[in-house]
Interface confidence: medium
Amino acid sequence: FNISGCSTKKLLWTYSTRSEEEFVLFCDLPEPQKSHFCHRNRLSPKQVPEHLPFMGSNDLSDVQWYQQPSNGDPLEDIRKSYPHIIQDKCTLHFLTPGVNNSGSYICRPKMIKSPYDVACCVKMILEVKPQTNASCEYSASHKQDLLLGSTGSISCPSLSCQSDAQSPAVTWYKNGKLLSVERSNRIVVDEVYDYHQGTYVCDYTQSDTVSSWTVRAVVQVRTIVGDTKLKPDILDPVEDTLEVELGKPLTISCKARFGFERVFNPVIKWYIKDSDLEWEVSVPEAKSIKSTLKDEIIERNIILEKVTQRDLRRKFVCFVQNSIGNTTQSVQLKEKRG
């Protein structure tokens, strides 16, 4: 299809080389009730339609994204050629940063009502640059946490070094929806609830003598509880003795509950005590078996190929630790009688 009639928007993504970062493009098609842009060309080239972020109007809920190769080749369907770019409804998610994401992206509805309709489409010219070290050293992270039940704030990473007074007007989106009220580089959340979690996008306009660009940053916001004040507790094994059959294989499971910590470095390991000696056992990797807002249950097994007489004299100790402290539970094997 002919893309010369597409409206054009220029975006700039300045990514930090220090952190993982995502990016999004919205299919900024006009809402049907607010513009005639998607109908037969009633607009002269000088008339600019009113462009509003896509809000999921029924007739525009299914869009197709393309990339325009710089060498003039035909448009490429995003889904077929770019595994690091994911389409979710009307939003294009870039999972990894890099200058190779620079280029022209075109979106249009899949359902074109009639062949006479001018292709209703938007062309987004994306420029991707790494952040220079001269930029702000303490810019806000692209991953921000809000503490449930308290007051918090979400900062626009690309503007977090500027004071509120010198900051340009910012447009914010949450999960693709315009937050019409928020206009500054920092959103104050009066009281944090779990519904504040999500993907926030902040946009502001940067102009030079030639043209203007929308500078965009994406913030993943997580709602969290306060860090635990407790050391982990061992849920299993509960008993300090375990009946076993000699010569048979044996798996002993250690399950421990760790309270939430923003910086989470759980330790769960098995070691063996034999008279005065003790040594750590190389056992299968620990795995998370349940994770909630407040805590996480982690399991790690010790596997004995076959229980020997010597094992009956040993103590098998599960050791768990977080930043607050550690807990141990020892198990003595006992031969099954009869």
Partner: antibody, heavy 121, light 111 residues
């Protein structure tokens, strides 16, 4: 019983300033509430003026027409004020103090009886 | 600010009848809409919050529906005591849900 009461309504001349006070009883303005002011001109509809968050952020929100001329403040754990400047006859109304709870459905669950402000020369 | 357009401005129905009041928001407010009843000389009383949830102590004859930009309040089996002015109200859509703009009101006359 939780109650709100407005005071400070008066007859004033155009161009004057006036401060209205909202006093809580049975609860304090330290929780996660929005305390807001709404007005109603005689025989007319309800008009939202401003809100303040009673929690730690103290965030304030204003109707676009009220910015600059009206100021909402929390003055104590049981009082919120509305300062009004450059009053005109169009500001003649009953002013209500109302309370909301952010997660409680985003609506005004508690209203004061109102205080009358008359601006006339 | 969002603009809330309420229709009709006035409606008259007999006892036992049904009244439907509509409220249209100038932008998508999801389900953040409340309905109030006001009688002369009294402050308004909350009837419905979050578009369809009945406030505590309110008769089930009142019901609310809608989402996005179109909302409806229905009063069924009208009683004389339902004669009042009814207002819709939206909520500021940001990260903080602050109730704000009201519709123009609908006067309900019960014959």
């Amino acid at each position: 019983q939780e109650q709100l009461e407005e005071s400070g309504g008066d007859l004033v001349k155009p161009g004057a300033s006036l401060t209205l006070t909202c006093t809580a009883s049975g609860f304090s303005f330290n929780g996660n509430y929005y305390i807001c002011w709404v007005r109603q001109a005689p025989g007319k509809g309800l008009e939202w003026i401003a809100c303040i968050y009673a929690g730690s952020s103290g965030s304030t929100y204003y109707a676009s027409w009220a910015k600059g001329r009206f100021t909402i403040s929390k003055t104590s754990s049981t009082t919120v004020t509305l300062q009004m400047t450059s009053l005109t006859a169009a500001d003649t109304a009953t002013y209500f103090c109302v309370r909301d709870k952010p997660a409680g459905g985003s609506s005004y669950t508690l209203w004061g009886p109102g205080t009358l402000v008359t601006v006339s020369s | 600010d969002v603009v809330m357009t309420q229709t009709p401005a006035s409606v008259s129905e007999p006892v036992g009848g049904t009244v439907t009041i509509k409220c249209q928001a100038s932008e998508d407010i999801e389900s953040y809409l409340a309905w109030y009843q006001q009688k002369p000389g009294q402050p308004p009383k909350l009837l419905i919050y979050q578009a369809s949830k009945l406030a505590s102590g309110v008769s089930s004859r009142f019901s609310g529906s809608g989402y996005g930009t179109e909302f409806t309040l229905t009063l069924s089996d009208l009683e004389c005591a339902d004669a009042a002015t009814y207002y819709c109200q939206c909520t500021l859509y940001g990260v903080n849900f602050v109730p704000n703009v009201f519709g123009g009101g609908t006067e309900v006359v019960v014959k």
